[in-house]
Interface confidence: low
């Protein structure tokens, strides 16, 4: 019968002919009366056989990622009789893997949005690289992920490519981060190949800033002839948050005279000081009131950022009008 060994040929061989192995019948006594033949796809072009000895050689560079195995047929003939010594038999030559492919991130570009001030350990996104080398062949396609850029705010799980927050971030200081992840094959050992990808991580706003008055003192004037409902001036606070989180409401905190009111212009986020009761220069020529400002929407769990409302003092001077 046939004496079989497993046949392997390393991919990307740079020798002109590589000895793959030998076909042999146990009836072959070495007196050169047998002739070995190779048939099938690749026979005669990729693989040749020494008909006398049965030695098979690869004469082309092979790429495992293109084709990982060749199925060939073997024949052995007794040249004195022209008859087959063994039944024709199918066998396989496997192309063995070398680490000739770097990891590639196929789903680029990566982009993620995560709320600012998210706690350590919050999952941001998972990046995945693929390696065309053989996953069953050593560590050629076993990947390790690492962070090239993004410390100290982000970390990556070495085996999964899961990016997590490792330090709280404040959108008001920086609203987006470019993280660069490297994937290395050979589990990072010497000779490893690597690929990189960039991840744009945008921070969404949370209401972690209270509105603060731009000025601690405002000076306004009102004519004693002004009717109730007159707008006598505006005050303004700023809030480092954006959108709904920056919407604010102004109100009177202190006005013993109950002469003034403040309404909020929700388009401009200004407070408009309104005359609630008519004033009389001869009766009182100046007033001091205190206004406060608060956010319109505050989540229960963010109340710690909004404990004390910002206040401002408003001095209002009454202008005299000549009376008949």
């Amino acid at each position: 019968g046939w004496v079989w060994n497993q046949f392997f040929v390393p991919e990307e061989m740079n020798t002109t002919s590589h000895h793959v192995g030998r076909l042999r019948s146990d009836l072959d006594n070495g007196n050169n009366s047998f002739q070995y033949k190779l048939l099938g796809a690749g026979a005669g072009s990729t693989f040749i056989i020494d008909e006398r000895t049965g030695d098979i050689y690869a004469i082309e560079k092979l790429d495992r990622e293109e084709r990982s195995l060749y199925i060939l047929r073997a024949q052995v003939i007794d040249i004195t009789t022209g008859r087959a010594v063994e039944p024709e038999s199918e066998f396989v030559i496997k192309v063995s893997d070398i680490n000739d492919n770097e990891p590639k991130f196929l789903d680029e570009p990566y982009e993620a949005i995560v709320p600012e001030m998210s706690p350590e350990g919050t999952l941001v996104i998972q990046v995945t690289a693929s390696d065309a080398d053989d996953p069953s062949s050593g560590n050629n396609a076993r990947l390790l992920y690492s962070l090239l850029q993004g410390q100290p705010y982000f970390s990556v799980e070495p085996t999964t490519g899961v990016i997590r927050i490792s330090s709280k971030m404040d959108r008001e200081l920086q609203d987006e981060y470019w993280v660069i992840i490297q994937a290395k094959d050979m589990i990072g050992q010497p000779g490893a190949l690597s690929g990189t990808t960039s991840v744009l991580i945008k921070l969404s706003d949370v209401n972690d800033n209270k509105p603060i008055f731009k000025e601690s003192l405002y000076r306004l004037t009102v004519s004693e002839s002004a009717p109730t409902g007159t707008s006598i001036g505006t005050i303004m606070a700023y809030d480092n948050d954006i959108g709904e989180n920056a919407e604010m409401d102004y109100s009177i905190e202190e006005d013993d005279s109950q002469t003034f009111d403040i309404i909020t212009n929700h388009e401009t986020q200004e407070g408009i000081v309104i005359l609630k009761k008519k004033v009389n220069f001869e009766h009182q020529n100046h007033y001091g009131i205190r206004a406060k400002v608060k956010n319109h929407h505050v989540d229960e769990q963010l109340m710690k950022y909004h404990t004390e409302a910002s206040t401002t003092f408003i001095k209002i001077q009454v202008e005299d009008v000549d009376e008949p």
Epitope: E120, P152, S167, D170, L173, I212, S216, K304, Y305
Partner: antibody
Framework: QVQLVQSGAEVKKPGASVKVSCKAS????????MSWVRQAPGQGLEWMGI????????TYAQKFQGRVTMTGDTSTSTVYMELSSLRSEDTAVYYC?????????????WGQGTLVTVSS | QSVLTQPPSASGTPGQRVTISCSGS????????VNWYQQLPGTAPKLLIY???QRPSGVPDRFSGSKSGTSASLAISGLQSEDEADYYC???????????FGGGTKLTVLS
Amino acid sequence: QVQLVQSGAEVKKPGASVKVSCKASRYTFTSYYMSWVRQAPGQGLEWMGIIHPSGGDTTYAQKFQGRVTMTGDTSTSTVYMELSSLRSEDTAVYYCARGGIKLWLHFDYWGQGTLVTVSS
Amino acid sequence: QSVLTQPPSASGTPGQRVTISCSGSRSNIGSNFVNWYQQLPGTAPKLLIYTNNQRPSGVPDRFSGSKSGTSASLAISGLQSEDEADYYCAVYDESLQGWVFGGGTKLTVLS
């Protein structure tokens, strides 16, 4: 009222290390950053670094990188600052100062200071 | 050499108004809140002004802070003898990723 109580004065030889402690009380220890600031005799204030006690995240001033280690113990509400390879110019009063809930918010409470003298 | 520049000394007579300046750059004063600390002789620093112009409770309204662009200033009106101290500005610096203090200003109240 927030309190920060620091360990007592130390005298060290050049090349040695010193570890100063700062015990915090009357606030939620894990919510606030803690900084260390030093002041050499007759000199100004110099920021050394900052730690967030909950995760142990630290940022050190470039000048002290490699020589300073800041740690926190949440079970005792204490932060520590260790300075190694001491030299005479490290003679200073070392203060711990409570920061805000964000890295860039002011230091509102300070410890009483710990005098470290480096002398052969 | 401090990242924030303050005059080394300032003086005034009781009742006068004194201003102390603090000059920085875009990465510090230009990007973040300025804070001021008062250090009385032989004591730990004390927060005097925070977030540019806010006073902690217990700080008299004679002390006020302001900021414009990359500079800030501390004003003390109605100067009193107990105001004699060292004053420091401090701010978080984005490019250094850390805090910076001014060199300090020694305020003398002349009698």
